[in-house]
Amino acid sequence: MMTGTIETTGNISAEKGGSIILQCHLSSTTAQVTQVNWEQQDQLLAICNADLGWHISPSFKDRVAPGPGLGLTLQSLTVNDTGEYFCIYHTYPDGTYTGRIFLEVLESSVAEHGARFQIP
């Protein structure tokens, strides 16, 4: 039975040219996290595997940095980066948990972060 829940940064916004941290956290389960996939609208951004470490997709290598933790840092943001992002937690024995984050990249200098998840 899957008892875990995923908390995410929720709906967030950032300035064009800036950077943003995408963060998910799996709680309420003792399942072993074997891998976390980060996806954007049917595209693989990065994978963090418990044994193998990080793999960043070649087309995102210049703009995506692993971490902090199991999170992902997007850099040099453009308006085209606006959209849905998903963290897919592969766990054993529970199975797969998915979290959703919506990022809006703004032209203006006013970009407010969602407050549902505190990033240290």
Epitope: D42, N49, D51, H55, Y92
Partner: antibody
Amino acid sequence: EVQLLESGGGLVQPGGSLRLSCAASGFTFSSYSMNWVRQAPGKGLEWVAAISGSTGTISYADSVKGRFTISRDNSKNTLYLQMNSLRAEDTAVYYCAREPYGVWMDYWGQGTLVTVSS
Amino acid sequence: DIQMTQSPSSLSASVGDRVTITCRASQSISYYLNWYQQKPGKAPKLLIYAASSLQSGVPSRFSGSGSGTDFTLTISSLQPEDFATYYCQQSYSTPLTFGGGTKVEIK
């Protein structure tokens, strides 16, 4: 350098058994999921079975379920495929393949031929 | 099971030609699509993974695109060493399944 070397193929009668081995070198074997994929003469590729590295989770194609058993010995860096109740339609070249991140198979062995015939 | 349908099953082309091979999944598989090249008597070789990522060491004339159910492998300028059979494979769910293959022959 990553290397995968299959062995154990040969001629076997219908109903017989065979055990294939895949010796791995050049990488941390225990960290990777591994697969067996087969190819009948003149035909396409067919996935047979997989075993994960971290949890030992196993899955099989319906065509071999209950007859084939995939296993691994991380201390020997070796993947196995125990094949029982062999049928003529199991005749194929059997490849082992490494699967990082559970998405793609990046390295394959050279294959070993299994022929099931009376 | 997810069925993978490749087209065409074979094609004839000349060196320098642009070649396109398509692969269609029977249900959405997101980006979980890989392309392999196989030459006679040899093991398959990974070309493209996760729909569009070029495997290290593979020439840049190979590219992949698509998501969901429809995918494409493109060879921008066919070279003599590219004459081979190409397979797509989905890794979205088990059983893992391959397309039937596309044999690229010399015209």
